[in-house]
Every structure is written in structure tokens, then in C-alpha cells.
Amino acid sequence: APTSSSTKKTQLQLEHLLLDLQMILNGINNYKNPKLTRMLTFKFYMPKKATELKHLQCLEEELKPLEEVLNLAQSKNFHLRPRDLISNINVIVLELKGSETTFMCEYADETATIVEFLNRWITFCQSIISTLT
């Protein structure tokens, strides 16, 4: 059974992940239309279901494509280089989802834009945090 300290740690990690994702979304939304238009040409894949921490596997698998889009915007609106930002997110995701069980991510048929993708994972973080508090 999860202890209060492990729950608190999970909550803090989720809050950290949430802040990183929100920072990326804010950075993207700051772009003038021409750049945003280019970023929106990238297709992202969404999980069929995202209700548990193990479903973060689906986020982990899309981090490299996310880094590619952020490379388009590398110097403008982010404090960190895309590689470092994604590396930080990857560390949190790996800790949160755990490595004990191998979960095969199932993806929805429809693709999403970067904005929809980030919003989906922001909602996921908020939802899990609310169950922990």
C-alpha cells in the first residue's frame, strides 16, 4: 500500500511534470502565427486511455517527437534547451510510471496537434493530482 510519504513524492513529481508541460504550452502559445502554423503540422499520438500512472508510457514514447518540435522554437520562449527540457521530463516520467511492469501503450486512431497533445497530458496530471489530494 502506498505510504503518505510516497504519495507526497508522487504528487510533487506530478506537479513538476505539470509545470513543465504548462511552460511548454505557454511558450508555444506565445508564438506569432507563422511559427505556430509550422509547429501545428507535426502530428502527435494520443493514448486511447490515460487514467493511471502506467499510462505515462504513452507520453514517454512521444517525447522525442516533442523535442523535435521544440527545436523549432529553441531559443525564444524556453529557459532550457529542448534536449535538457525533454531529458528532465523523461526522468520524472520514468520515476512516476515505474519500471517494474512493461505496459504496451495503445494509441487512439486520430492524431493530435502539439497543443492538443500538451493539453491532454496537462489534464492527465491535474486529474491524478486531484485524486492524491
Epitope: 499520438y45 514514447e61 512521444e62 522525442k64 529553441q74 531559443s75 494509441y107
Partner: antibody, heavy 121, light 113 residues
């Protein structure tokens, strides 16, 4: 049709700089990134970096960071690659390239004819 | 950076015979969401720029003869020329286009035996 036409061959002294141009036609230069790839004589291909002509955003390979400058002039549909502090190992053919119509960044589908830069004292 | 290892360095094949070139990446190039491998193959003849043959490991570029085919997934990939023609003499390179910086293999020289 898409065409990338590069400037002519250059001979440079060690320590100097070279600026190679790449004129795009057959599409709007602001719609795609322009990449630069080099190839030393008898050697393989090495990606140097890209520029987004839309806003001048650049992304350089770590190896060339600080020595290469990519720029673009949208009014003439021309991209430029400037390499400074030249040394003999920089002797190579320099290519500009563009991605496929259907892919935002890679792979490189359209290439310039190449510009030979020779660095010799 | 992702390291691309190509083999063999050179290959001599008789006209009309099959030529096979291998490429191995240091990390998986498979994107789970779309099941695509971000690997391309190029042909380069002397004095010419590289020519895109195949991308996403197995998608032929428009106008490329169908004797050229690509296969493989994850970290192991193959370019096959089913029936070698004289005009296929060239150096062939693989390229990973999954993550920046894109990286090329060292090349495989294909000659007529």
C-alpha cells in the same frame, strides 16, 4: 519544380571565413527549413545545422556551434552558410538541402548541386 | 547522438544479382504511435549530391525504380537492390531522421563484379 542553386567553388586561407549561398526556387522559401550538410573529399555526409527562413531561427550541430552562422534573405529566396576560422579539415563540398513536401523537418529530399570549399595556405 | 553503423564498407555484385546493405542504429528509430521507423536511404554518384531513395525505412521516394526496397525495424535496417543495374554503381548512405542531429552511416560502395 523545387530547385536549390548554390554559389561557385571557393579557395580560402586558413583562419579566414567563407560564405556560401543557396538560392531556392519552385516554392516559397519560408515554408521549409533549409539544412546544410558537408562532405569532405572521399568521406561521408555530416549535418551542420538548419535555418528556418520564416524567422531566422537556427539549430546547429554541436561540432560547428560558434563557427557556423546560417542566415536567410526572404526577399531574394536565398540562404547563406558562413563558416569562420577555417582550417584544412574544412575542405569539403557544402550542400544545402530541404525536406520532403510531406515531412516538416527531415529527411532531405531536395539538394543543391554542392559548393567545393578548399582551405589551403 | 545516434550512431549509424553501415556494413559492408564495399560490395561487388554481378549485374542482375541482388545487393544487400545493412544499417544499424545505436537507438531505436521506431515511433510507437505511428509504427514508423525514421530511417532513410540515399544513393550518391561521383560529383553529384545524394539522392533520396527510401524514407520511413520502406517508403519509396517518387520516381525511384522498384528494384530498390527497404526493410527493418527498431535498430536494424536493410536496403536491397533486387537486380543490380550498371547505373546503380554508387555509394549508399543510411540516415536516421528521428531526432536532431540527424546522422548518416559511413556509406557502402557498390560496384560491379
Amino acid at each position: 519544380q523545387v530547385q536549390l542553386v548554390q554559389s561557385g567553388a571557393e579557395v580560402k586561407k586558413p583562419g579566414s571565413s567563407v560564405k556560401v549561398s543557396c538560392k531556392a526556387s519552385g516554392y516559397s522559401i519560408t515554408d521549409y527549413l533549409i539544412h546544410w550538410v558537408r562532405q569532405a573529399p572521399g568521406q561521408g555526409l555530416e549535418w551542420m545545422g538548419w535555418i528556418d527562413p520564416e524567422d531566422g531561427e537556427t539549430n546547429y550541430a554541436q561540432k560547428f556551434q560558434g563557427r557556423v552562422t546560417l542566415t536567410a534573405d526572404t526577399s531574394t529566396s536565398t540562404a547563406y552558410m558562413e563558416l569562420s576560422s577555417l582550417r584544412s579539415e574544412d575542405t569539403a563540398v557544402y550542400y544545402c538541402a530541404r525536406s520532403l513536401d510531406s515531412t516538416p523537418i527531415y529527411p532531405f529530399a531536395y539538394w543543391g548541386q554542392g559548393t567545393l570549399v578548399t582551405v589551403s595556405s | 547522438d545516434i550512431v549509424m553503423t553501415q556494413s559492408p564498407d564495399s560490395l561487388a555484385v554481378s549485374l542482375g544479382e541482388r545487393a544487400t546493405i545493412n544499417c544499424k542504429s545505436s537507438q531505436s528509430l521506431l515511433r510507437s504511435g505511428n509504427q514508423k521507423n525514421y530511417l532513410a536511404w540515399y544513393q550518391q554518384k561521383p560529383g553529384q549530391p545524394p539522392k533520396l531513395l527510401i524514407y520511413y525505412a520502406s517508403t519509396g521516394q517518387s520516381g525511384v525504380p522498384d528494384r530498390f526496397s527497404g526493410s527493418g525495424s527498431g535498430t536494424d535496417f536493410t536496403l536491397t537492390i533486387s537486380s543490380l543495374q550498371a547505373e546503380d554503381v554508387a555509394v549508399y548512405y543510411c540516415l536516421q531522421h528521428y531526432i536532431t542531429p540527424p546522422t548518416f552511416g559511413a556509406g557502402t560502395k557498390v560496384e560491379i563484379k
